[in-house]
Every structure is written in C-alpha cells, then in structure tokens.
C-alpha cells in the first residue's frame, strides 16, 4: 500500500541525487530502513537529478553544509557540500564534520567537556544556527520575498527559514518548500544518519526548537539501532553552548 511506501510518521523518502555534488554518491544508496532507492518510489522519475539545492545548513545531511560551490560563484546557487575534516579551514561549525567544530577558522576535534559525545547527532540540529553562506553572499531575492509583506505563516511557500514567521522553518513538502512549525519537546524529529540522506526527503520536518536537540528516545528500545525513535529533548546543563 502507499502507506507502507510513504509512512507519514517518519520522513518520507526519495532516491538520492545521481552523480551529484560532493557528499552525494552517484550510486544508489544501500538498503537501510526508511530509505527508498531508484525505482522504489512510484511518484518520482530518476532521470533528472541535480546536486541538492539548499538555503541553509539544516537542509543538508550531518556530513554536509550549505554553500556556494565556487568561491566566486553565483550567490543565488547553493548546494550541499561535503563537510570539512579536522585541520581544514572553516567559517562556521556546520562546515566541520561531526565530532569537530570551527575554532579560529580551523576545524578542530570537539572536546568532550565542551560538546557532548553525541555531537555528531546534534551538530546541525540546534536552534540558532549561523545561516550565513560560505562567502557571506547575500542570497538572490525572488517572488517569494517580494510577495510577502509579512513573514510566511504555516503552509506558506518559502525559500529559506528567514522567510517564515517566528517558530517556523522552511522545509520541503511535496515539490515545494513551505513554512512548518519548529519542533517542540517530545515531538518526533528526523536524524540524517547517512551521508546525503537529506536529499531523500520530500516531507521534511523542522529542526528542534531552542534548547532542544534531536536524540534517541531513552525508553524506545528496538532491535535495530537505525530504526530507533528520535525526539526533541532538552539539552543537559553542560550542553548549553550552541554549536553554530
């Protein structure tokens, strides 16, 4: 049935981009719970994939960040790029691979007392991320910003979260991106467990709200680690520092 293909209580998935940008391997993803492969979704063709476009880091996988692919490139074109490894140059935390953060322009290993061991699960999902682009370009304005005299409400089409009213983020829904509510404590959230997996989503959830991060629900015991339920949970006291 359709519900077994697109379960509304989890991110609904599409095949990954073929031959896309860094972080998006051209081959089909290997079998994993909740992920469909080329030919696995009857509502989409797979003959015209492109590098995954983005407006902010939350739209990219845990191993990626959002930026213009070329330093002198078109400011209006941003895609998800592979994260930067330890000792590589950076401008913000999201550019660094999980387990690292940006310090003095260099990706360095996260100190366990500074960031929790679960940083790889939360680095792109804390509220208040720095959404600046790699080179500080201003983003292209289109009809969406011209048409809005006020910030977008729930269900409004958006290009980025700044188009949306407070408490909302810009996330994919079907073939558009719309303003959806930022997640509250206890609500189910989505983990990007596999590189590039964000590109599979056609029904994105927002990130967790301020002071919350997306973690495995403590009392949710299942046989498979990858199918554990994640919910928005309060940070512990030593986890108040925002990563971005």
């Amino acid at each position: 049935t359709l519900n077994s293909v697109l379960n509304s209580n989890a991110i609904k998935n599409l095949p990954p981009p073929l031959g896309g940008a860094a972080g998006h391997p051209g081959s089909a993803v290997s079998a994993a719970p909740g992920i469909l492969y080329p030919g696995g979704n009857k509502y989409q063709t797979i003959d015209n994939y492109q590098p995954y476009p983005c407006a902010e880091d939350e739209e990219c996988g845990t191993d990626e960040y959002c930026a213009s692919p070329t330093r002198g490139g078109d400011a209006g074109v941003q895609i998800c790029l592979a994260c930067r490894k330890r000792r590589k140059r950076c401008m913000r935390h999201a550019m660094c691979c999980p387990g690292n953060y940006c310090k003095n322009g260099i990706c360095v290993s996260s100190d366990q007392n500074h960031f929790r061991g679960e940083i790889e699960e939360t680095i792109t999902e804390s509220f208040g991320n720095d959404h600046s682009t790699l080179d500080g370009y201003s983003r292209r304005t289109t009809l969406s910003s011209k048409m809005y005299h006020t910030k977008g409400q729930e269900g409004s089409v958006c290009l980025r979260s700044s188009d949306c009213a407070s408490g909302l983020c810009c996330a994919r829904h079907f073939w558009s991106k719309i303003c959806k509510p930022v997640l509250k404590e206890g609500q189910v959230c989505t983990k990007h467990r596999r590189k590039g997996s964000h590109g599979l989503e056609i029904f994105q959830r927002c990130y967790c709200g301020e002071g919350l991060s997306c973690r495995i629900q403590k009392d949710h015991h299942q046989a498979s680690n990858s199918s554990r339920l994640h919910t928005c949970q309060r940070h512990h006291h030593h986890h108040h520092h925002h990563h971005h």
């Epitope: 359709l2 519900n3 697109l6 509304s8 609904k12 599409l14 509502y43 989409q44 063709t45 015209n48 994939y49 492109q50 995954y52 476009p53 289109t142 009809l143 969406s144 048409m147 729930e154 269900g155 409004s156 089409v157 290009l159 996330a171 829904h173 079907f174 073939w175 558009s176 719309i178 959806k180 509510p181 056609i202 029904f203 959830r205 927002c206």
Partner: antibody, heavy 117, light 111 residues
Framework: EVQLVESGGGLVQPGGSLRLSCAAS????????ISWVRQAPGKGLEWVAS???????YYPDSVKGRFTISRDNAKNSLYLQMNSLRAEDTAVYYC???????????WGQGTTVTVSS | EIVLTQSPATLSLSPGERATLSCRAS??????????MNWYQQKPGQAPRLLIY???KQGSGIPARFSGSGSGTDFTLTISSLEPEDFAVYYC?????????FGGGTKVEIK
C-alpha cells in the same frame, strides 16, 4: 500579474501523442513548483504531474511511463509530453502552481485534450 | 492513497443563506502541525480557484464569507451568506501525502 496560459490540446487517436505547453508570466518561474491537473468531462479533478523548482519530477501511477513533465526556465514554460494516449485521458488539462502556499493557488484556463477514434 | 468524500453531493440554497459543505478523509491529513486540507471553487467553463488552504487559511483575495474549519479527517467549508456568484462546485483536496487527491465535489445550486 501572475498568468498561466495552456496550449497544445486537440483531438488525437488512441495510442497517439500530444505535447501540451504552459506559458508562465508574472513570477520568477524557475523558483517554483508547477503541476498539471486534469478534469474529465463532468468529473472531478485529478493530479497528473509536477516538477519542483529544483527539477525533480513526480507522477501518479495512472500516467507514469506515458507522460513526461518538463520545464524550460529560460522560456518560462512548462510542458507535458503525452504518449500512448487512452480514451480515459480525455480531459481539460490545467497547469497550476504553488506560489504563496503549498496548495494549487494559481491556475491556467485549461486546454482540452480529446482522445477518440 | 487518501480518499476524500464530500457531502452532500448537491446543496440547494437561496442567496443570503448559510452553506455548510463537508469533506471527510479516509485517514488523517494532519502532519507537521498543519492540516493539509484545501478547498477550491469552480464555476462552469472556468479553472478552479483556491479558497482555503491549511484547513482554515484564506487564499489571496478570497471574501471573508468563506471560512474553513476542521482537523484530522473531518473538515468543513462554510459560506456565511451566499452571494449570487457563489453558486458553483466546491472541491476539497489533501496535500498530506502523494498523490494529492481531490474530493468528488459538492454542487451549490440556487433553490
């Protein structure tokens, strides 16, 4: 002013092909999703195909493999290539877009496709 | 796919009267804190026009006499006081899941 103008409809025999066009104006075409929705005579509405602003395409089972949606952002145009047409494809075909919200908030006036021998 | 059932099929009313149209979904169309239910009006020979989206939000330029309510599986479109131009067919449509589906329509005719 947002405008969507369909063309290309007509009479075609079963098994034949037809290409519909939708000319868009009044908005930044390349940034937005756009779809085809059809309505058989005296019947309700049925979603036919959609293409996102980033170029992915989507179809229901009823047309998958027979219809192809495409867009030419340079020409602000949307297309629907219809092959292996059947009598049940007879309908008014509308292009519709989602500019302000996720629903189909702007529609063209429609173009009529008749599949008959 | 989600099936939408509209009732009644035909509603015979006079100008000035209140119209209440119903749409029932085969499963909940709520997700992400939003009810993904929309309502359209269609007059003979014309394209549909969006009236309501997200169950209760008005489309652009829609008169205040049109309002939507409901959540989950049961939704209502209300026209507080029918104007002559309101006699038309009304469709509900869900955007929670692919494929997006439409109800069979309710025809509001002059009594």
């Amino acid at each position: 002013e947002v405008q969507l103008v369909e063309s290309g409809g007509g009479l075609v025999q079963p098994g034949g092909s037809l290409r519909l066009s939708c000319a868009a104006s009044g908005f930044t075409f390349s940034s937005y999703a756009i779809s085809w929705v059809r309505q058989a005579p005296g019947k309700g509405l049925e979603w036919v195909a959609s293409v996102s602003g980033w170029g992915d395409t989507y179809y229901p089972d009823s047309v998958k493999g027979r219809f192809t949606i495409s867009r030419d952002n340079a020409k602000n145009s949307l297309y629907l290539q219809m092959n292996s047409l059947r009598a049940e494809d007879t309908a008014v075909y509308y292009c519709a877009t989602s500019l302000k919200n996720y629903a189909f908030d702007y529609w063209g006036q429609g173009t009529t496709v008749t599949v008959s021998s | 796919e989600i099936v939408l059932t509209q009732s009644p099929a035909t509603l015979s009313l006079s100008p000035g009267e209140r119209a209440t149209l119903s749409c029932r979904a085969s499963e909940s169309v709520d997700d992400f804190g939003i009810s993904f239910m929309n309502w359209y009006q269609q007059k003979p020979g014309q394209a549909p026009r969006l009236l309501i989206y997200a169950a209760s939000k008005q489309g652009s330029g829609i008169p205040a006499r049109f309002s939507g309510s409901g959540s989950g599986t049961d939704f209502t479109l209300t026209i507080s006081s029918l104007e002559p131009e309101d006699f038309a067919v009304y469709y509900c449509q869900q955007s929670k899941e692919v494929p997006p589906t439409f109800g069979g329509g309710t025809k509001v005719e002059i009594k």
